[in-house]
């Protein structure tokens, strides 16, 4: 079962995601999707990071630790009840069938 | 207009080797996923292997993991499965599919045309 | 494995029908359910993904619904060229899988 994290609405939500770089600035992509984590990849892409930066985000969505040392945990601004459900956090660790994924469950009071 | 035209396919006894070529056409290859199904003569279809679109990434079926392996090379627009230890069970059709993923994943948008693989001694 | 069970494995219908057809998944797959239909001799074509998102340029009459466990496929009224096989698939969780397929045949 998914980790389960609150907050309030009007807040910001905190959906914490880590994983350790082989070396510093060594990243590898990172997915966020609204909905638990598929097959492969992301469903319903919120927020995207390459190799270098973060390349695709929605609004509200964004990085607030340091990425580049391999805090990948997502703030989600201003949240409303919509914004509960299940998030995926995929960390696509390269090599055959490498990836690390996350199910948290975000609860909006 | 979106093309995958698969090559490679034929009857290679049992033990034997094949390398299955998908040729892209018409969209960004290095934009998408790439994967590898097969169809049964019994009609069954099964995902056999996936590829990023860096090629980083790589997912196989269990039971070809250690014997097939899928690659791509971006620059030809060409996704590719190399089939050793080819065994009865993978007679089939196989079909290359693009796979949609950036702001949502979506297994096989298009499909190529199908090339057979015959293992028979 | 999660296994994907199509029912019925064949069905009779006719032109302007309403047809269902339904997957069942072994394991929890949220919406991660996709459909394709197959003509004799061609390449799955992809009709639905998120089990109810018709891809672009499928026709209004197929529909797809469902979450958890439980999915159908619905064409509301069957045109001629219709008649061909069906499966589903789920990409839930590794390996990806597909149903055993329905085909839809002529009464």
């Known amino acids: 079962s998914e980790v389960e994290y609150r907050a309030e609405v009007g807040q910001n939500a905190y959906l914490p995601c880590f994983y350790t770089p082989a070396a510093p600035g060594n990243l590898v992509p990172v997915c966020w999707g609204k909905g638990a984590c598929p097959v492969f990849e992301c469903g319903n892409v919120v927020l995207r990071t390459d190799e270098r930066d973060v390349n695709y985000w929605t609004s509200r969505y964004w990085l607030n630790g340091d990425f580049r040392k391999g805090d990948v945990s997502l703030t989600i601004e201003n949240v409303t009840l919509a914004d509960s459900g299940i998030y995926c956090c995929r960390i696509q660790i390269p090599g055959i069938m490498n990836d690390e994924k996350f199910n948290l469950k975000l609860v909006i009071k | 207009e979106v093309q995958l035209v698969e090559s490679g396919g034929g009857l290679v006894k049992p033990g034997g080797s094949l390398r299955l070529s998908c040729a892209a056409s018409?969209?960004?290859?290095?934009?998408?996923?790439m994967s590898w199904v097969r169809q049964t003569p019994e009609k069954r279809l099964e995902w056999v292997a996936t590829?990023?679109?860096?090629?980083?990434?790589?997912y196989y079926l269990d039971s070809v993991k250690d014997r097939f392996t899928i690659s791509r090379d971006n620059a030809k627009n060409s996704l590719y499965l190399q089939m050793n230890s080819l065994r009865a069970e993978d007679t089939a059709v196989y079909y290359c599919?693009?796979?949609?993923?950036?702001?949502?994943?979506?297994?096989?948008?298009?499909w190529g045309q199908g090339t057979t693989v015959t293992v028979s001694s | 494995d999660i296994v994907m069970t199509q029912t019925p494995s064949s069905l009779s219908a006719s032109v302007g029908d309403r047809v269902t057809i339904t997957c069942k998944a072994s394991q929890y797959v949220d919406t991660y359910v996709a459909w394709y239909q197959q003509k004799p001799g061609k390449a799955p074509k992809p009709l639905i993904y998120s089990a109810s998102t018709r891809h672009t340029g499928v026709p209004s009459r197929f529909s797809g619904s469902g979450s958890g466990t439980d999915f159908t496929l619905t064409i509301s009224s069957l045109q001629p060229e219709d008649f061909a096989t069906y499966f589903c698939?789920?990409?839930?969780?590794?390996?990806?899988?597909f149903g055993q397929g329905t085909k839809l045949e002529l009464k």
């Open positions: 018409g969209f960004t290859f290095s934009s998408y996923y």
């Open positions: 599919a693009r796979d949609p993923y950036y702001s949502n994943y979506v297994p096989m948008d298009y």
């Open positions: 698939a789920q990409y839930s969780s590794s390996p990806l899988t």
């Open positions: 590829i990023s679109n860096s090629g980083g990434s790589i």
